[in-house]
């Protein structure tokens, strides 16, 4: 049976004066020689040789200073051996407890703690939790840390409360005001022995977050400006406001609005995000003849909603703005503001180039006459079909059109014409609508049964031919008006749905005749231009065979009647 005792040892002290600090004996010692051996940490394991045993007596001595934080207790394995080196007892585990001394200060987990809290937060709102540890014995006074605020910057009324035991930083009042102090620096100490022992300091940086608790206020009580009629302005006036909330945030950013006077939507207010100024813009021209001055009322709020702490105090405060409209000499304008041109029915979509639509001149509003010293150009010109003469304002086609063009909407193409005053550079815009027909690009054509007839019986059958089946019979055959001062020479009589008889109404001399024929189908569709039929009338012999041939481009070419020459 073992007989044992062990005294606790204090760290950081020379405990050798109290040796032996432990003793082991076996009751077998009374009957035989016993040798004592010890092993374990501090003996034959690092740190080596702290404990030694007297092999004969079993006295255990301490030989070195120990550190509790390194080894809170030593477990010594003890053996009692007989002369043969055999254990006479079961090995004994002897515990030597190391007593703590306060040799470690508290250590904060961060040298600087960062936190943030909204201004106007309720008192006792949690800001942050500080964290510190002490290496001394847990649950012992040596490691019990007490926190306290050493200093606050800016100084003055203490704004924060630090829980002595938990390290919680809370607001002391509900009067945090970012506009007074946007951040606080606390120096905090943590002392062990519940505040009486070793201490360490750390820093707490607390950012006071902005809330929208300040109303934007106009710097001036009223504003005024002057603007010429008929013009737009990207900056007529600037309004300055003061807002104490954090710059460049939505709490600071001003939103300007009209409370009255802008019923005509002439004005807009845009915020300059750099300066927070309101920029009054004229987006719709004013007319002096209708309005000589405009009395606006404006107000301002923020992009962000106001904080609940102040919202009940917000009132829309209108600030007057007087705009004086200045009369100017009237410029140029298109009257009416749009003009419609119509492409003649029957024009081919492939024969539009150089087709003249007409003129669209701007007028001088002072004289109500066609404007002089203006230059005309096309503005919007989808598809690029139209061109305007810079001086005469004559509009023509410069491009042929695909009948399926996406620019034809409701049989109309739309473009804009600009008139630029060469003195002032002012521009007026007119809208051009061009109504286009259903282009008859495959319109019916006429063919003569023969291209030569005898002068004795000058008649020939004309037949209608079509290139596609959109043109349906019956066809109407008509002769284009003969040149003025000439009596009608030819007549045409319908024979059936697709042909007619062309004949001379009187005896006519031999020659080559060009006869203009107009063909119209049952839907009243017709070609762009009359068909020009070339017919040779010749002197025939008694067998009805032509005797003379006439060149088609000679000066003697006939247009319905004999040509008298030059």
């Amino acid at each position: 049976e073992w007989v044992k005792f062990a005294k606790p040892c204090r760290e950081g002290e020379d405990n050798s004066k109290r040796n032996p600090i432990a003793k082991i004996t076996s009751d077998y010692q009374a009957t035989q020689k016993i040798t004592y051996r010890i092993s374990g940490v501090g003996i034959d394991q690092p740190p080596f040789g702290i404990f030694v045993v007297d092999k004969n007596t079993g006295d255990i001595n301490i030989t070195a200073i120990v550190d509790r934080e390194e080894t809170p207790s030593f477990l010594i394995t003890c053996r009692a051996l007989n002369a043969q080196g055999l254990d006479v007892e079961k090995p004994l585990i002897l515990t030597v407890k190391i007593l703590d001394i306060n040799d470690n200060p508290p250590v904060f987990s961060q040298q600087i703690f960062m936190g943030e809290i909204e201004e106007n937060s309720a008192s006792n709102s949690l800001v942050m939790i500080l964290n510190a540890t002490d290496a001394d014995e847990p649950n012992h006074l040596n490691s019990k840390i007490a926190f306290k605020i050493v200093s606050q910057e800016p100084a003055g009324t203490p704004m924060f409360l630090l829980s002595r035991n938990t390290g919680e930083v809370r607001t002391l009042t509900n009067s945090l005001d970012r506009e007074q102090a946007s951040s606080y620096r606390l120096v905090v100490s943590g002392a062990d022995k519940d505040g009486e022992g070793l201490s360490t300091q750390c820093e707490c940086n607390i950012k006071v977050k902005d809330v929208n608790d300040n109303f934007p206020m106009f710097r001036d009580s009223q504003y005024s400006a002057r603007i010429e009629e008929n013009i737009l302005s990207s900056e007529l006036l600037r309004f300055q406001v003061t807002d104490l909330d954090e710059e460049y945030t939505d709490n600071w950013l001003a939103v300007y609005f009209f409370t009255s006077g802008n019923e005509g939507n002439w004005f807009e207010i845009q915020t300059d995000p750099r300066t927070n100024e309101g920029i009054l813009k004229v987006v719709k021209a004013l007319d002096y003849e209708q309005l000589q001055s405009v009395k606006l009322s404006i107000a301002v709020k923020n992009k962000a909603e106001f904080h609940q702490s102040v919202i009940s105090r917000y009132r829309v405060q209108s600030t007057p703005v007087t705009i004086q409209v200045i009369n100017v000499r009237e410029g140029i304008a298109f009257r009416p503001a749009s003009k419609t041109f119509t492409v003649q029915k029957g024009i081919s979509s492939k024969k539009l180039v150089d087709y003249i639509l007409g003129t669209y001149q701007a007028i001088d509003e002072d004289t109500n006459k066609a404007a002089s010293n203006v230059k005309y150009v096309m503005g919007r010109n989808d598809g690029g079909y139209l061109m305007i003469d810079s001086k005469t304002a004559e509009i023509k086609f410069v491009k042929n059109m695909n009948r399926d063009s996406t620019f034809i909407v409701n049989k109309t193409i739309t473009a804009e014409v600009l008139a630029i005053d060469e003195y002032t550079g002012k521009t007026s815009t007119g809208t051009v609508y061009v109504r286009v027909p259903d282009f008859n690009d495959n319109c019916p054509t006429a063919v003569l049964e023969k291209d030569a007839v005898c002068s004795s019986s000058p008649s020939v059958v004309v037949s209608a031919r079509t290139l596609n089946n959109r043109y349906t019979g019956p066809y109407t055959f008509a002769l284009e008006d003969q040149p003025v001062k000439l009596p009608a020479v030819w007549s045409i009589t319908t024979l059936n749905a697709t042909s007619a008889l062309l004949r001379a109404q009187e005896q006519i001399p031999p020659g080559v005749y060009h006869i203009s024929l107009v063909l119209t189908d049952s839907q009243n569709n017709r070609c762009e231009m009359p068909r020009s039929l070339t017919l040779e009338v010749c002197q025939c012999d008694n067998r009805g065979i032509c005797g003379t041939s006439y060149p088609t481009t000679s000066p003697g070419t006939r247009y319905g009647r004999p040509h008298s020459g030059r």
């Epitope: 003649q344 024009i347 024969k351 180039v353 150089d354 087709y355 003249i356 007409g358 003129t359 096309m378 010109n381 598809g383 690029g384 061109m387 005469t392 004559e394 023509k396 410069v398 491009k399 042929n400 203009s516 762009e528 231009m529 009359p530 020009s532």
Partner: antibody, heavy 113, light 111 residues
Framework: EVQLQQSGPELVKPGASVKISCKAS????????MHWVKQSPEKCLEWIGQ????????TYNQKFKAKATLTVDKSSSTAYMQLKSLTSEDSAVYYC??????WGQGTTLTVSS | DIVLTQSPASLAVSLGQSVTISCRAS??????????MQWYQQKPGQPPKLLIY???DVESGVPARFSGSGSGTDFSLNIHPVEEDDIAMYFC?????????FGSGTKLEIK
């Protein structure tokens, strides 16, 4: 079918004037500009000017402004070009044209003493 | 005035070959996405005949062997294959700005 029939060749003395005609048929005469082009013996083509047959409005190449006068007679669908103070430099073939797609056969003008 | 420089002044090709005639404008003849450039063929004793308009649109009735290309200031007329009937003078013309101007012409001959 569009046809432009021009008057015949002209032989005139220096300093005189000449009026060339161009009769249009087969299309709406007043709907398109009538252009006039000079082709000198070296074969190069020069645009003289254009006339709007509907209004009589003209646009000239600055080079020919003092030389040519363009007119029309709507009733006969005929365009005219008068050339004045003629010199040998004016000897050329003159064409009328409805844009580029229809041309007259050309009128040869010879200026010689 | 817009000056049109045509090249070459003349060229001789074998029948069946391809030929390209160039025309360079002193400034752009582009107008809202369309090049206002025409090409004409002229045979002796005849008026010019329109081949190509809008730089690349082939006039109706003109054989498919004629084609036009280019935009801005550089244009070309291509004939492929060349036939006997193509022996003629060829002119480019711009209608972007008054005065409308013509190139100096290219004479096409057969080898």
């Amino acid at each position: 079918e569009v046809q432009l029939q021009q008057s015949g060749p002209e032989l005139v003395k220096p300093g005189a004037s000449v009026k060339i005609s161009c009769k249009a048929s087969g299309y709406s005469f007043t709907a398109y500009y009538m252009h006039w082009v000079k082709q000198s013996p070296e074969k190069c083509l020069e645009w003289i000017g254009q006339i709007n047959p509907s209004t009589g409005g003209t646009t000239y190449n600055q080079k020919f402004k003092a030389k040519a006068t363009l007119t029309v007679d709507k009733s006969s669908s005929t365009a005219y070009m008068q050339l004045k103070s003629l010199t040998s430099e004016d000897s050329a073939v003159y064409y009328c044209a409805r844009w580029g797609d229809s041309w007259g056969q050309g009128t040869t003008l010879t200026v010689s003493s | 005035d817009i000056v049109l420089t045509q090249s070459p002044a003349s060229l001789a090709v074998s029948l069946g070959q391809s030929v390209t005639i160039s025309c360079r404008a002193s400034e752009s003849v582009e107008y809202y996405g369309t090049s206002l450039m025409q090409w004409y063929q002229q045979k002796p004793g005849q008026p010019p005949k329109l081949l190509i308009y809008g730089a690349s649109d082939v006039e109706s009735g003109v054989p498919a062997r004629f084609s036009g290309s280019g935009s801005g200031t550089d244009f070309s007329l291509n004939i492929h294959p060349v036939e006997e009937d193509d022996i003629a003078m060829y002119f480019c013309q711009q209608s972007r700005k008054v005065p409308y101007t013509f190139g100096s012409g290219t004479k096409l001959e057969i080898k």
